[in-house]
């Protein structure tokens, strides 16, 4: 492990105030959603957010963990095994696969900290990598050589 | 702002050790990149990582900031304005647009902390939202109604 110098303010200061300024905005993907008339269907819409206009459409599933920062993460779930035809927006094209794009996101878990004699001293943050699926992507199938 | 209780270990303890276990591994997308024979070209490969097999192919650009956690972020950059034909893997299909998928990622910036009399007391972490582009997605163009 390597470390950043961290902050231990003087006695009487609010450590939590100094340590993490943690605003209350959740962190979902950026583009706001508009209604998808077929919310779970395998079709590419001509309006709405990116995930419903994609020819590899997906929905988001909430993953909440109260001991993690961020507490709310969203996992993409593909709605189709293949890509949707650009021509019709509804029929599947077996020449393309709809594949999940994964990412190891940095998250922080809170865990008890211990003082000199093993006493509980509030909470510390432990950095971890957490696998999330970001989106579904229309790809050409791998050619096995 | 609201806060998590944080840890201020007793004198003599390694605060940085307790506070944040911060491994030195950068956090690129999960799938290891293999060389794309046409690294900057607008084509969909039949092998290699997801971003080169996609019909909306993209490359990653490193964004490094040593005062930020994570220090390394990657921004997707689309290689084509339209989607690549599933049939040929090289010709563009004007019926589909290659669009960036954005996300507001939680990051932490380090900044000086100040003690009781304004003295410098190491570093604190400040949470921010940071806009990153995750991938390029093949979408049906919006129909303006």
């Amino acid at each position: 492990y390597s470390h950043w110098p961290s902050c231990c303010p003087s006695k009487g200061q609010d450590t939590s105030e100094e340590l993490l300024r943690w605003s209350t905005v959740p962190v979902p993907p950026l583009e706001p959603a508009r209604p998808n008339r077929h919310p779970e269907s395998c079709r590419a819409s001509e309006d709405g957010p990116l995930n419903s206009r994609a020819i590899s459409p997906w929905r988001y599933e909430l993953d909440r963990d109260l001991n993690r920062l961020p507490q709310d993460l969203y996992h993409a779930r593909c709605l189709c095994p293949h890509c949707v035809s650009l021509q019709t927006g509804s029929h599947m094209d077996p020449r393309g696969n709809s594949e999940l794009l994964y990412h190891n996101q940095t998250v922080f878990y809170r865990r008890p900290c211990h003082g000199e004699k093993g006493t509980h001293k509030g909470y510390c943050l432990e950095r971890r990598l957490y696998r999330v699926s970001l989106a579904c992507v229309c790809v050409r199938p791998r050619v096995m050589g | 702002y609201s806060h998590w209780p944080s840890c201020c270990p007793s004198k003599g303890q390694d605060t940085s050790e307790e506070l944040l276990r911060w491994s030195t591994v950068p956090v690129p997308p999960l799938e290891p990149a293999r060389p794309n024979r046409h690294p900057e070209s607008c084509r969909a490969s039949e092998d290699g990582p997801l971003n080169s097999r996609a019909i909306s192919p993209w490359r990653y650009e490193l964004d490094r900031d040593l005062n930020r956690l994570p220090q390394d972020l990657y921004h997707a950059r689309c290689l084509c304005p339209h989607c690549v034909s599933l049939q040929t893997g090289s010709h563009m299909d004007p019926r589909g647009n290659s669009e960036l998928l954005y996300h507001n990622q939680t990051v932490f910036y380090r900044r000086p902390c100040h003690g009781e009399k304004g003295t410098h007391k190491g570093y604190c972490l400040e949470r921010r939202l940071y806009r990153v582009s995750l991938a390029c997605v093949c979408v049906r163009p919006r129909v303006m109604g």
């Epitope: 943690w22 605003s23 209350t24 905005v25 959740p26 979902p28 993907p29 583009e31 706001p32 959603a33 998808n36 919310p39 957010p49 995930n51 929905r59 988001y60 599933e61 909430l62 909440r64 109260l66 920062l69 507490q71 709310d72 969203y74 809170r110 | 702002y1 609201s2 806060h3 998590w4």
Partner: antibody
Framework: EVQLVESGAEVKKPGASVKVSCKAS????????MNWVRQAPGQRLEWMGL????????SYNQNFKGRVTLTVDTSASTAYLELNSLRSEDTGVYYC???????????????WGQGTLVTVS | DIQMTQSPSSLSASVGDRVTITCSAS??????LNWYQQKPGKVPKLLIY???SLHSGVPSRFSGSGSGTDFTLTISSLQPEDVATYYC?????????FGQGTKLEIK
């Protein structure tokens, strides 16, 4: 003033579907998740699921075995609950409830709609 | 799923009495517990969040305590307008679950 106004009572046959709407006003609709809670006659409150209007992200109660679909129309600040394959035990009052939160201590349903009575018979 | 059990299921008390309702979780939920009040024929209202924090506009005679698996809602001096059914709810994990409710009446 925060208000959640639900659609009117419904009477449905077993096997049919029902769609209940919940129109929000007085706050930023996309900034808060929306929960749906059911109360069958004389029964405890039962959480059905929630949706984040910002991205359509959902979490469902699996006890409903995939019969529930939650959607939103952010342009109309309206959330929708659709329940399929209705049976007599689905009779009850269906509430939408806004979820307030701070960053780590709480998630709580601070404003509720007036409820929609759905009768299956 | 996390089971929430309230006791008693119903109780009758006099105006001015101190009233205690308990809620037990089938596993530890830290302090991730809310209390709701539902008056007859009305919509549920948030009373207490995060075990002990009073929601805005709620009278100070209401208080909450507990941690882990055992929680308590206390009304220090019962008023006629407190006649209602009270529900606890955990939010540690999905699906959110509620207690079966405690119906409070005036003697």
């Amino acid at each position: 003033e925060v208000q959640l106004v639900e659609s009117g009572a419904e009477v449905k046959k077993p096997g049919a579907s029902v769609k209940v709407s919940c129109k929000a006003s007085g706050y930023s609709f996309s900034g808060y998740t929306m929960n749906w809670v059911r109360q069958a006659p004389g029964q405890r409150l039962e959480w059905m699921g929630l949706i984040n209007p910002y991205n359509g992200g959902t979490s469902y109660n699996q006890n409903f075995k995939g019969r529930v679909t939650l959607t939103v129309d952010t342009s109309a600040s309206t959330a929708y609950l659709e329940l399929n394959s209705l049976r007599s035990e689905d009779t009850g009052v269906y509430y939408c409830a806004r979820e307030d939160f701070d960053s780590w201590t709480f998630f709580a349903m601070d404003y509720w709609g007036q409820g929609t009575l759905v009768t299956v018979s | 799923d996390i089971q929430m059990t309230q006791s008693p299921s119903s109780l009758s008390a006099s105006v001015g009495d101190r009233v205690t309702i308990t809620c037990s979780a089938s596993q530890g939920i830290s302090n991730y517990l809310n209390w709701y009040q539902q008056k007859p024929g009305k919509v549920p209202k948030l009373l207490i969040y995060y075990t002990s924090s009073l929601h805005s506009g709620v009278p100070s005679r209401f208080s909450g305590s507990g941690s882990g698996t055992d929680f308590t809602l206390t009304i220090s001096s019962l008023q006629p307008e407190d006649v209602a059914t009270y529900y606890c709810q955990q939010y540690l994990a999905f699906p959110y679950t509620f207690g079966q409710g405690t119906k409070l009446e005036i003697k």
